[in-house]
Structures are given as structure tokens and as C-alpha cells.
Amino acid sequence: HTAAQDNCTCPTNKMTVCSPDGPGGRCQCRALGSGMAVDCSTLTSKCLLLKARMSAPKNARTLVRPSEHALVDNDGLYDPDCDPEGRFKARQCNQTSVCWCVNSVGVRRTDKGDLSLRCDELVRTHHILIDLRHRPTAGAFNHSDLDAELRRLFRERYRLHPKFVAAVHYEQPTIQIELRQNTSQKAAGDVDIGDAAYYFERDIKGESLFQGRGGLDLRVRGEPLQVERTLIYYLDEIPPKFSMKRLTA
């Protein structure tokens, strides 16, 4: 069974409705907003999570230099269209018929257009750079310890295979986590780096998506690691297509 059988909840996604109406009375959970069944033994796709978020009631550097093609999610929240597998559809449109193309993490990678805009394929984001600044501590963290704990976090909490955590860089107070996952590397059942990065981002913001778990309490040799700002850069297998007007703005 895919959900916690005893009380029928989804450990990996609190933005679900669960009931024992699966085969043989098993617990089955559906994402808010889309109503799609989700596998509660792994992370839910970012597309379904964004859709659920939009449907929920609203409350009143040796650090890496991101390449010129790196995308930052400046557009913020939108209500996405997801395919039957829960992935982002390559073309997204809003209610006013403004459309744009997105990558596999749902970040816009073209200028906005109208309904005639074509997005031939969903371009995969194969490299994610998570740039963190931690709050002041008595001294710098040990780089090796930091690497060990962040790799453990992604492995244990987000179930991301260690081979996809390409590097952890540290120059106090900046930490950079590089996630890399080519299409050819991702096997069936592997957590997507985009989904892991999104769960991590929400954890860092104190908006954990896990059911009933406390917020993220990250410690390195007992010393709390408190993040005060996060920037995430996305690199696609095919560079984005923006007009020069945007690039020089």
C-alpha cells in the first residue's frame, strides 16, 4: 500500500485527501487541485504540488558561478497544467490566454506569447544549483561534515540517490548544493532532482510538505544550520530562448 495504512494519510504529501477506497480497502491518496492519485512512498511531483498549492485556501564561490543560461524562478506561483504522469506540460497558459514554455521544473524558459505559441517538447532541467546563505555561527562549519550532512539529508529525507548530489561547495556563509541528473541517468523509481529541490526549498522556508513531520532541523555535529536566504538556479539540457530585450533589461 502506498499510504500509511493505519490512519490513512500520505507521509510524503500533506496536500492530499486520503480514503480507504483503493483495491481491497487500501488507503489511497489524491492530490488536492488535480485529484490525481499519488504514490505516498516517494515525493509527489512539483507540478501536482503547485496545483494543490494554488487550490488551497489562501491566508490573508570556490563557489559555482551560474552559467549565462541559468534560470531563476522569478515568475512565482501559477496554476500549472500537468500531464497524466504529473509532469509539467511543456506549454503553460494563464486565464487571459497568455502562454509560455516551461522546463521540467515548471520554470518559464521562453518569452510569453499567445495561444499560437508552440512548445515542442518538455526540456529537462539537468542541473540545479541551490545557493544558501547560513546565519552567523561561532565559527565556520567543517566542509567535509557539511557535505556529509547535506548528502544525508537529500538521501534520507528526499530519497534522492547520492549520485545525483554532484557537489557541496562552501565558503562561509555561502553553501552551494549542485544536483545533476541527465535523462539517461534517471532510472524508473528515481526521485527527480527538481522534485527534491522543491521539497528542500519548501522545508527551508518552514513550509514542509511532509505529513506530520516537524520542520527541517538541520545540524552539523550538533550545531544548528540555519538558512537565511535561498536562491535556486536551473540549467536545462537545451538553453532557454528569450529575446534580447529581456536579456538586456
Epitope: S144, D147, A148, E149, P162, R213, R219, G222
Partner: antibody, heavy 117, light 111 residues
């Protein structure tokens, strides 16, 4: 100095549950680190069973996932192992150990468990 | 699971000589800054004792006669010179991937 001490029944009947306690002195289990159970079979093979973290998260060896539970009592600075449906193959010396940053720097002395009717 | 194969299973070395124990992993246990391989010594009736962490770092209180080296899949524990107190079984352990796994052990004896 950090010290860990296991305690348990010594003998358990097949199909029953095994419960072990690890008492920790010299460090609060909520302050940091990961608190593990490791067992050593009669042929000396070592097997990592799982841990409970400083903030109460669990991580288990998939080979035991449906039978194992690791919990804690923060007021007593203890953590516990429960293993269900034991068989003679679970006969082993059970150790608790502290995982610092993915290696085990402090170990208990171990408690021997025999599964037999 | 990552399988760790230790060799030789047993080793007899003369006092004052060098002992070399090998541990081979079924896949890489390295990250960009770490090598997640560790070494332990176990004497009869005692728990394992940490000697070397992250491939080459000597644990506090361990004599400098013990050293570790290697990367990716091939790691070595060296004891030089061997002393009578070193008679024990030595284990490698990886922590790059869940579940953590141990090697089968190498028994060191004095020739």
C-alpha cells in the same frame, strides 16, 4: 565522556517481538547526531539496522523495514529497538552506536540475544 | 546495496612488519569532498572501535601506526609497524548510500 549501554532480555521465543534499550550518558540524544542499532551475527558479519536522529527522524535498513521500529524517550535519554516476528536468524549481539557524520564513533558493549523456543 | 569485499580474510604478520588490508566497494563511495569509507578494529568480546574515518582521517587517540588511503572503490588500511596489541579483526564500512554496509572482516594474527 559519551557512553552507551544496551539492555535486553537475552532470550526471545520465535515469532515474538524483541525489545532492547540503549541508555546514553554524557550527551543529550536531542542535541545532535544519529543513534543507531547494529547487530553482529555469530559468524561475525555486521549489519546496520537503522537509526533515530536528534530530531526524531528514522532511517531503517530496507531488509528490516517491515519489522523494525526505533523510538526514544528524551526525558530518560534512551532509545529503543523493537523487532517483530523474530526467528533464530535474528540471534546476534546487538550494539547501539552514535553516528557522528556517517561513521560510528561511540559504541555500547553489546547485548547478546538468542532466539530459541 | 553497496557490497564491501575485504581481502585477505586473514593475515599473519611478523611483529614490526607492515600489515595491509584491502576493501573494495561494488560502486564508488566518494563525493566531491569526501570518501565515505571508515575502518574499525574489533577484539574478542569487545565492540568495534573506530580507527579511521572518511578513508584517511585518524580518529582521536588512535596511534599513528594506523593509516588509511584510497578513493572511489578501492581502499586500504595499513598498520606499520605491527604490534602485539593489534591482533584483532578489522572491518571497513561505507556510508555513502543507504543502507550502510560493512566488509566481512580481516583477522590479523602475529606470525
Amino acid at each position: 565522556d559519551v557512553q552507551l549501554q544496551e539492555s535486553g532480555p537475552g532470550l526471545v521465543k520465535p515469532s515474538q517481538s524483541l525489545s532492547l534499550t540503549c541508555s546514553v550518558t554524557g550527551y543529550s540524544i536531542t542535541s545532535g547526531y544519529y543513534w543507531n542499532w547494529i547487530r553482529q551475527f555469530p559468524g561475525n558479519k555486521l549489519e546496520w539496522m537503522g537509526y533515530i536522529s536528534y530530531d526524531g527522524r528514522n532511517n531503517y535498513n530496507p531488509s528490516l523495514k517491515n519489522r523494525i521500529s526505533i523510538t526514544r524517550d528524551t526525558s530518560e535519554n534512551q532509545f529503543f529497538l523493537k523487532l517483530n516476528s523474530v526467528t533464530p536468524e535474528d540471534t546476534a549481539t546487538y550494539y547501539c552506536a552514535r553516528d557522528t557524520t556517517a561513521y560510528f564513533d561511540y559504541w555500547g558493549q553489546g547485548t547478546t540475544l538468542t532466539v530459541s523456543s | 546495496d553497496i557490497v564491501l569485499t575485504q581481502s585477505p580474510p586473514s593475515l599473519a604478520v611478523s611483529l614490526g612488519q607492515r600489515a595491509t588490508i584491502s576493501c573494495r566497494a561494488s560502486e564508488s563511495v566518494d563525493s566531491s569532498v569526501n570518501r565515505f569509507m571508515h575502518w574499525y578494529q574489533q577484539k574478542p568480546g569487545q565492540p568495534p572501535k573506530l580507527l579511521i574515518y572518511r578513508a584517511s582521517n585518524l580518529e582521536s587517540g588512535i596511534p599513528a601506526r594506523f593509516s588509511g588511503s584510497g578513493s572511489r572503490t578501492d581502499f586500504t588500511l595499513t598498520i606499520n609497524p605491527v604490534e602485539a596489541d593489534d591482533v584483532a579483526t578489522y572491518y571497513c564500512q561505507q556510508s555513502n548510500e543507504d543502507p550502510y554496509t560493512f566488509g566481512g572482516g580481516t583477522k590479523l594474527e602475529i606470525k
